[in-house]
């Protein structure tokens, strides 16, 4: 499955939206910094099957969508920008889902290794736990927004490697 060019554009637009969403300076939130143990190894590997890479990308986008579509998120961010973010993420999920169906099932057998997906889930679980502990404060959301940008940046690198493999 070839990811459409629009997927890369959507990814870029998502990064721009996340950047525009910033409400306060990260420098004023230094005391709230947190290491979420981003699973970098899941985004570095050239050892990835294409199916696995697509599934990891899908999981990152799905978890990002879930994170920003909570009640607490809608209070924290500009509604107009959030709506645009949902649209971008939803489109990317659709692009990837079409690919997942083609790549993951070959001859009726699933090729997915769940380990990478679980690493992504544990990472997002730490993010949601952090937000809960910080009572969804503006600084906590700002730290999380910056962290999601970082994870999207790594996702982009994985996408680029996927494109080069095609």
């Amino acid at each position: 499955c070839d990811l459409p060019q629009t997927h890369s554009l959507g990814h870029r637009r998502t990064m721009m939206l996340l950047a525009q969403m910033r409400r306060i300076s990260l420098f004023s939130c230094l005391k709230d910094r947190h290491d979420f143990r981003f699973p970098q190894e899941e985004f570095d590997g050239n050892q990835f099957q294409k199916a696995e890479a697509i599934s990891v990308l899908h999981e990152v986008i799905q978890q990002t969508f879930n994170l920003f579509s909570t009640k607490d998120s809608s209070v924290a961010w500009d509604e107009r920008l959030l709506d645009k973010l949902y649209t971008e993420l939803y489109q990317q999920l659709n692009d990837l889902e079409a690919c997942v169906m083609q790549e993951v099932w070959v001859g009726g057998t699933p090729l997915m290794n769940e380990d990478s997906i679980l690493a992504v889930r544990k990472y997002f679980q730490r993010i949601t736990l952090y937000l809960t502990e910080k009572k969804y404060s503006p600084c906590a959301w700002e730290v999380v927004r910056a962290e999601i940008m970082r994870s999207f940046s790594s996702s982009r690198n994985l996408q680029e490697r996927l494109r080069r493999k095609e």
Partner: antibody, heavy 122, light 107 residues
Framework: EVQLVQAGAEVKAPGESLRISCKVS????????ISWVRQIPGKGLEWMVK????????IYNPSFQGHVSISVDKSITTVYLQWSSLQASDTAIYYC???????????????WGQGTLVAVSS | DIQMTQSPSSLSASVGDSVTITCRAS??????FHWYRQKPGKAPELLIY???NLQTGVPSRFTGSGSGTECTLTITSLQPDDFATYYC?????????FGQGTKLDVR
């Protein structure tokens, strides 16, 4: 086949130290949280602590924090629960459990060890 | 901590009967409710996760429902194996907590 195999029963005196183990096999060790659950004989279940074997990130039940510690040895896919000074009230069965984590980030305990009975008595 | 209260605490029934066990949480736990069965002398085993999902290998006689602060476990056509203690659990907030258990015995 997923297996969590726990060490045998232990009889200890108050004040002694103890480390019990849970050897896992049948899946990628670093992919799933592991928890310990206590059951005092004839009583209910209490969650104690969980650990991510990937980087030893831990979350404790405040009721147990400071009294027990959890650790892992990735090289032998084993999780440990340790006491530096046992009390009679630590007498219980201790279960290690594997967590599954759904896409909506719901934890549940999908595989349990057979349990280790710890008896603390003078 | 989120308190989990099961009712009834004990229950008598016969093979072939249907029974329902209820679990109430002291605050909303969404669908982060799970049910376990513990046979005497054995480790607990997962029956239902996320309020209503049947764990692989568990017979369809077990059904779970509910969300928010209340969920129920229903067992239809009781089998001899089902006489055991049942626990609900929440994993919505730390610390994770269990109900006190419901002992199901033979009438």
């Amino acid at each position: 086949e997923v297996q969590l195999v726990q060490a045998g029963a232990e009889v200890k005196a108050p004040g002694e130290s103890l480390r019990i183990s849970c050897k896992v096999s049948g899946y990628t060790f670093t992919s799933y949280w592991i928890s310990w659950v206590r059951q005092i004989p004839g009583k209910g279940l209490e969650w104690m602590v969980k650990i991510d074997p990937r980087d030893s990130y831990t979350i404790y039940n405040p009721s147990f924090q400071g009294h027990v510690s959890i650790s892992v040895d990735k090289s032998i896919t084993t999780v440990y629960l340790q006491w530096s000074s046992l009390q009679a009230s630590d007498t219980a069965i201790y279960y290690c459990v594997r967590h599954y984590l759904t896409q909506s980030l719901v934890d549940y305990f999908d595989h349990w060890g057979q349990g280790t009975l710890v008896a603390v008595s003078s | 901590d989120i308190q989990m209260t099961q009712s009834p605490s004990s229950l008598s029934a016969s093979v072939g009967d249907s029974v329902t066990i209820t679990c109430r949480a002291s605050q909303s736990v969404s669908n982060y409710f799970h049910w376990y069965r513990q046979k005497p002398g054995k480790a607990p085993e997962l029956l239902i996760y996320s309020a209503s999902n049947l764990q692989t290998g568990v017979p369809s006689r077990f059904t779970g429902s509910g969300s928010g602060t209340e969920c129920t476990l229903t067992i239809t056509s009781l089998q001899p194996d089902d006489f055991a203690t049942y626990y609900c659990q929440q994993t919505h907030g730390y610390p994770f907590t269990f109900g006190q258990g419901t002992k199901l015995d033979v009438r």
